[in-house]
């Protein structure tokens, strides 16, 4: 009588997924810029700000065609992971100047935990190298000052901006790939 | 609907070897990281392999290490795991799953015995 | 001995709630990798039943929910019933192992 039917397709293809996973990072990368413009009409930023315990920018726009899913998907789980560790400390030591910022900053932690689990999964379906989600990291330092809590929403804004920039572009590159 | 059928399963002595195949359809097939888990008489599932949905990347349970070869064919949709140097340790119910594994065939006996 | 440990048994009236549990390590589940869980109906193929610790598949009804904190992961089914009599098993990906680990296998049994 021939094989017994199989399941109905229970969850999505991880093509759709990595469309889901697209449509995700874009909406973030518009809290992220929106929170960015909202810290900057409170506390005008005087230069750019850096922040040593920041991942650097994992690749330019111009280097994306050489790039293989594996390392993107792996090296964009852990930039945003160290910014999500990040935005977590920002919220708990940035000190009351910051608490202004509420309660989108909470809202752009809970998106980043959530993109952060839909590339977890997205590597579990491809049955990709698994790094630990994560990872021990040493705690970072409360910031000197007032001024310190806020220098470093900047550059964890900006960093994060640009880290989502460039995962928009790379997860679109890699769909053709898929 | 998509669907897992596994084939290649039987009787075969110690030392012996056997290949499975897994026929996939109703999905995209090269797009799923592929599983092989096994299931001795009444006992629980045990994940034997997995490979990549290209085929790059592939692991092992220790229990198969070196005896077992997991592949693929994502142009006819079909997973293979080559067994040899089987033991009476190794009969179980083969189940090949995609994804998670989100998908899962009904499964090939494999019995080792002499 | 499964990397990944749950009860044997568990039991419960139909109407009842009941969970199950299933505790890892810090290479599984404390590690940070999520817990997916199946249902195996006697004689048949397992069936994915919970995926990303708390994500229901189509098609699984609202009554079964998961959960997971530290290097422990929980699986409740409420409203029970004769039907939900299966074997149930937690699985997560193990970094010392480079592929998922399964729990024992838990026995339902609906009295």
């Known amino acids: 009588p021939g094989p017994p039917p199989g399941p109905p397709r229970v969850s999505p293809d991880p093509r759709a997924e990595l469309d889901s996973t697209v449509l995700l990072t874009r909406s973030l990368l518009a809290d992220t810029r929106q929170l960015a413009a909202q810290l900057r009409d409170k506390f005008p930023a005087d230069g750019d700000h850096n922040l040593d315990s920041l991942p650097t920018l994992a690749m330019s726009a111009g280097a994306l065609g050489a790039l293989q899913l594996p390392g993107v998907l792996t090296r964009l789980r852990a930039d945003l992971l160290s910014y999500l560790r990040h935005v977590q400390w920002l919220r708990r030591a940035g000190g009351s100047s910051l608490k202004t910022l509420e309660p989108e900053l909470g809202t752009l932690q809970a998106r980043l935990d959530r993109l952060l689990r839909r590339l977890q999964l997205l590597m579990s379906r491809l049955a990709l190298p698994q790094p630990p989600p994560d990872p021990p990291a040493p705690p970072l330092a409360p910031p000197s000052s007032a001024w310190g809590g806020i220098r470093a929403a900047h550059a964890i804004l900006g960093g994060l901006h640009l880290t989502l920039d460039w995962a928009v572009r790379g997860l679109l590159l890699l769909k053709t790939r898929l | 609907e998509v669907q897992l059928l596994e084939s290649g399963g039987g009787l075969v002595q110690p030392g012996g070897s056997l290949r499975l195949s897994c026929a996939a359809s109703g999905f995209t097939f090269s797009s799923y990281g592929m599983h092989w888990v096994r299931q001795a008489p009444g006992k629980g599932l045990e994940w034997v392999s997995v490979?990549?949905?290209?085929?790059?990347?592939?692991y092992y349970a220790d229990s198969v290490k070196g005896r077992f070869t997991i592949s693929r064919d994502n142009s006819k949709n079909t997973l293979y795991l080559q067994m040899n140097s089987l033991r009476a340790e190794d009969t179980a119910v083969y189940y090949c799953?995609?994804?998670?594994?989100?998908?899962w065939g009904q499964g090939t006996l494999v019995t080792v015995s002499s | 001995q499964s990397v990944l440990t749950q009860p044997p048994s568990a039991s419960g009236t139909p109407g009842q709630r009941v969970t199950i549990s299933c505790t890892g390590s810090?290479?599984?589940?404390?590690?940070?990798?999520?817990v997916h869980w199946y249902q195996q109906l006697p004689g048949t193929a397992p069936k994915l039943l919970i995926y990303?610790?708390?994500e229901r598949p189509s098609g699984v009804p609202d009554r079964f929910s998961g959960s997971k904190s530290g290097t422990s992961a929980s699986l409740a089914i409420s409203g029970l019933r004769s039907e939900d009599e299966a074997d149930y098993y937690c699985a997560a990906w193990d970094n010392s192992l480079n592929g998922p680990v399964f729990g024992g296998g838990t026995k339902l049994t609906v009295l």
């Open positions: 490979i990549s949905y290209d085929g790059s990347y592939k």
């Open positions: 810090s290479s599984n589940i404390g590690a940070g990798y999520d």
């Open positions: 990303s610790n708390n």
């Open positions: 799953a995609a994804g998670v594994p989100d998908y």
